[in-house]
Interface confidence: low
């Protein structure tokens, strides 16, 4: 969490941002909140990015003002206009690109004063893994697949019964480049699976950590997956 204050003493307002990660090709949110004003027309929101000449986004007098917007963001940004009045200056970024990563500044002007806070935005690709029993294999194996990751993640298998066991000798992981030549499909196979056990396939890079669990018993197979972003820090 980053909390910024205006530069000039009594004419300062508190602006708060939260570091976050964007999944390339999808839409992302750059979070920013501020002390609200009672008049929408008195609020100016400017989003800037370090190293970029033009603005990322500007909202003033109750509407978007995009004539000074940098070309790399044109047609891809929006604020939540109906929430500005309650102090939400968060920016929606469409079709996140790798090059969108960097330091952003959320700069706010209201009738109460000015304030700003920086936000670190990481970009990459992350997706939920799915673990299945691989019935094509000669012996009982598990197959963990996740369609989109970048940068290349690590894959670790774990089991509930054999806690602390190292499965690297009995697993094989491959990374297949996707058609857009950036993200990769992750496939990991675990051999010599025993029944009445729960196995976890953990995929992690510096942006996200995702886990796919599978419980294998004689009578049923249960699956569960979850994904966690690693760098969501507030400022």
């Amino acid at each position: 969490l980053i909390i910024g204050f205006g530069i000039s003493g009594r004419h300062s307002i508190t602006v708060t941002t939260v570091a976050s990660a964007g999944n390339i090709g999808e839409d992302g949110i750059l979070s920013c909140t501020f002390e609200p004003d009672i008049k929408l027309s008195d609020i100016v929101i400017q989003w800037l990015k370090e190293g970029v000449l033009g603005l990322v986004h500007e909202f003033k007098e109750g509407k978007d003002e995009l004539s000074e917007q940098d070309e790399m963001f044109r047609g891809r940004t929006a604020v939540f206009a109906d929430q500005v009045i309650v102090g939400n200056a968060s920016l929606r970024l469409k079709n996140v690109q790798l090059t969108d990563a960097g330091t952003y500044k959320c700069y706010i002007i209201t009738s109460k004063g000015k304030g700003n806070a920086n936000l670190e935005y990481k970009t990459g690709a992350f997706s939920m893994p799915e673990v299945n029993v691989d019935y094509n294999a000669s012996s009982e194996t598990l197959r963990c697949e996740a369609p989109r990751w970048f940068p290349q993640p690590t894959v670790v298998w774990a089991s509930q019964v054999d806690q602390g066991a190292n499965f690297s000798e009995v697993s094989n992981t491959s990374f297949e480049l996707n058609s857009e030549n950036v993200t990769m499909k992750v496939v990991s196979v675990l051999y010599n699976v025993t029944i009445n056990n729960t196995y976890s396939c953990m995929i992690e890079n510096d942006i996200a950590k995702a886990t796919g669990d599978i419980k294998v018993t004689e009578s049923e197979i249960k699956r569960r997956s979850h994904l966690q972003l690693l760098n969501s820090k507030a400022s």
Epitope: S67, D70, E71, R74, G75, R76
Partner: antibody, heavy 120, light 108 residues
């Protein structure tokens, strides 16, 4: 050095078609919005449309005067911009320019222009 | 859609004169760009983002304005300044670049 060079202009009959090309060099073509602008004899500048960059999915916008008749495209492997003009009218007679958006909503580089004459 | 109206359309002036060209937008815009064009040549970027001179543009040129009215001023007209000047802006809704009709600066 940034360069934009148009070609493909000429004399065409009303109702005919023509394809203009704009070969570019000296910059990363896929990073930029590219536009076509024309200028009828003795008249002002008229934007025909533009095609966005890679980050914005190469989507296109057209002015009302040419929508449905003209099609813009780009070949990023060849660093080239194209304008396919169909159902040409006499009022399409003009010098046609390709132009690069500077990242700041104005055109920082223009081609030398290619002349299209629509006449029977 | 935003329309840009330039005035005057034609302007006769002498070397050394102070010249002002106006561009009016049909609704408020936050910046304006200007181009210079000479006969048989491509337009050249002249002033961008209301008041910034493009590379190589002499300091006798200046730009100003806000809202719906923008101006290009030449403090002391020189022989090489005789040309046509166009204003231009970017509108995001609908997304489009718009040009003014042009102002031709001629020798008196």
């Amino acid at each position: 050095e940034v360069q934009l060079v148009e070609s493909g202009g000429g004399l065409v009959q009303p109702g005919g078609s023509l394809r203009l090309s704009c070969a570019t060099s000296g910059f990363t073509f896929s990073d930029y919005y590219m536009s076509w602008v024309r200028q009828a004899p003795g008249k002002g500048l008229e934007l025909l449309g533009f095609i966005r960059n890679k980050a914005n999915g190469y989507t296109r916008e057209y002015s009302a005067s040419v929508k449905g008749r003209f099609t813009m495209s780009r070949d990023n492997s060849k660093n080239s911009l194209y304008l396919q003009m169909n159902s040409l009218k006499t009022e399409d007679t003009a010098v046609y320019y390709c132009a690069r958006d500077s990242h700041r909503t104005y055109f920082d580089y223009w081609g030398q222009g290619t002349t299209v004459t629509v006449s029977s | 859609d935003i329309q840009l109206t330039q005035s005057p359309s034609f302007l006769s002036a002498s070397v050394g004169d102070r010249v002002t060209i106006t561009c009016r937008a049909s609704s408020s815009v936050s910046s304006m760009h200007w181009y210079q064009q000479k006969p048989g040549k491509s337009p050249k970027p002249w002033i961008y983002a209301t008041s910034n001179l493009a590379s190589g543009v002499p300091s006798r040129f200046s730009g100003s304005g806000s809202g719906t009215e923008y101006t290009l001023t030449i403090s002391s007209l020189q022989p090489e300044d005789f040309a046509t000047y166009y204003c231009q802006q970017w509108s995001s809704n609908p997304p489009m670049y718009t040009f003014g009709g042009g102002t031709k600066v001629e020798i008196k």
